[in-house]
Interface confidence: low
C-alpha cells in the first residue's frame, strides 16, 4: 500500500530536493528558502530566484523552507525554573535548560520543569543525576526511600510500603517494648 501523503507533501514530492512546486503553477519548481529566511514571494518562473527575506528579530527558521512567516522564538519558562542556555538566532530557536545540579522533569513532550538533584543524605548515590533523571539513591540501614529522600525508619507507618525495608528495625522496637512488659 502507498502511504497517503498530505497535499503539501504531494506537491513537494513532484519537485527535486531543495525545491517546492509553485502554488499557482504546478509546472514551476521554486528553490526553497535557506534557514534563517522565509518566503516573501514565489519565484516568477523556471530558473528564477525565489524572493526570500531574513527573519526579523524574535523569529527564526531552523531549516530550508517555504514558510510565509518565520516562527516565533520560544521563551524559557522561569516559573518552571528554566534558564536560557543559548538565545534565539534567525536560524535557531532559543535553547532552554536547567541550572547546574538540577534535572529536567518532563510533564509532557515539550514541557519540563527543573528540580534540584537529590543529595542522597543518609544514603549513597546509586546513579548520578542526569539531564532528564534525578539521582537514584540507596539508603543506609535504618532509612527508607520516600520521594527520593532517605527518611528514618522511625517515620515508617505500618500501612506504608516501607515496612518491608524497615522490618528489622520495627521488630527490634517491638522486642524492646515486649521485654519491658514481663
Amino acid at each position: 500500500l502507498v502511504p497517503h501523503l498530505g497535499d503539501r507533501e504531494k506537491r513537494d514530492s513532484v519537485c527535486p530536493q531543495g525545491k517546492y512546486i509553485h502554488p499557482q503553477n504546478n509546472s514551476i519548481c521554486c528553490t526553497k528558502c535557506h534557514k534563517g529566511t522565509y518566503l516573501y514571494n514565489d519565484c516568477p518562473g523556471p530558473g528564477q530566484d525565489t524572493d526570500c527575506r531574513e527573519c526579523e528579530s524574535g523569529s527564526f527558521t531552523a531549516s530550508e523552507n517555504h514558510l510565509r512567516h518565520c516562527l516565533s522564538c520560544s521563551k524559557c519558562r522561569k516559573e518552571m525554573g528554566q534558564v536560557e542556555i543559548s538565545s534565539c538566532t534567525v536560524d535557531r530557536d532559543t535553547v532552554c535548560g536547567c541550572r547546574k545540579n538540577q534535572y529536567r522533569h518532563y510533564w509532557s513532550e515539550n514541557l519540563f520543569q527543573c528540580f534540584n538533584c537529590s543529595l542522597c543524605l543518609n544514603g549513597t548515590v546509586h546513579l548520578s543525576c542526569q539531564e532528564k533523571q534525578n539521582t537514584v539513591c540507596t539508603c543506609h540501614a535504618g532509612f527508607f526511600l520516600r520521594e527520593n529522600e532517605c527518611v528514618s525508619c522511625s517515620n515508617c507507618k505500618k500501612s506504608l510500603e516501607c515496612t518491608k525495608l524497615c522490618l528489622p528495625q520495627i521488630e527490634n522496637v517491638k522486642g524492646t517494648e515486649d521485654s519491658g512488659t514481663t
Epitope: 528540580f115 534540584n116 538533584c117 527520593n148
Partner: nanobody, 119 residues
Framework: EVQLLESGGGLVQPGGSLRLSCAAS????????MGWVRQAPGKGLEWVSQ????????YYDHSVKGRFTISRDNSKNTLYLQMNSLRAEDTAVYYC????????????WGQGTLVTVSS
Amino acid sequence: EVQLLESGGGLVQPGGSLRLSCAASGFTFVKYSMGWVRQAPGKGLEWVSQIADTADRTYYDHSVKGRFTISRDNSKNTLYLQMNSLRAEDTAVYYCAIYTGRWVPFEYWGQGTLVTVSS
C-alpha cells in the same frame, strides 16, 4: 507542618463548571509558585496549571487553556482553579501543590479532590 486541603470537586455534566479551592497552611504562602496537577484513573500525573508567587503570571497546559483559570488570594492563603466547559477527559483527581524547586515534582501534596465529568 505543611498542609494543603483541596475542595470543590464533584460530579458535573459535560460543558459544566466547577471551582476548586485549596486552603494552604504551615508555610509562607506568598513566597511560592503554586500549581494544580491531576491524575486521571489509571494514568500518570499531568501538569494542569501554575501561578507565580505574586499572581502576575499564570501558565496552562494546552489541553485546558481557555477553559481553566488559576488564581490565588494571598491574603487568604488560598489557591483556586475555575474550570469551565468541562469535558469527559477532565475527569481526574486534582491536586494542589507547591513548587519549591527541590527534589521531586511538587514536593508537598494535598489529598486531592475528585472531579467527574459525565452525563
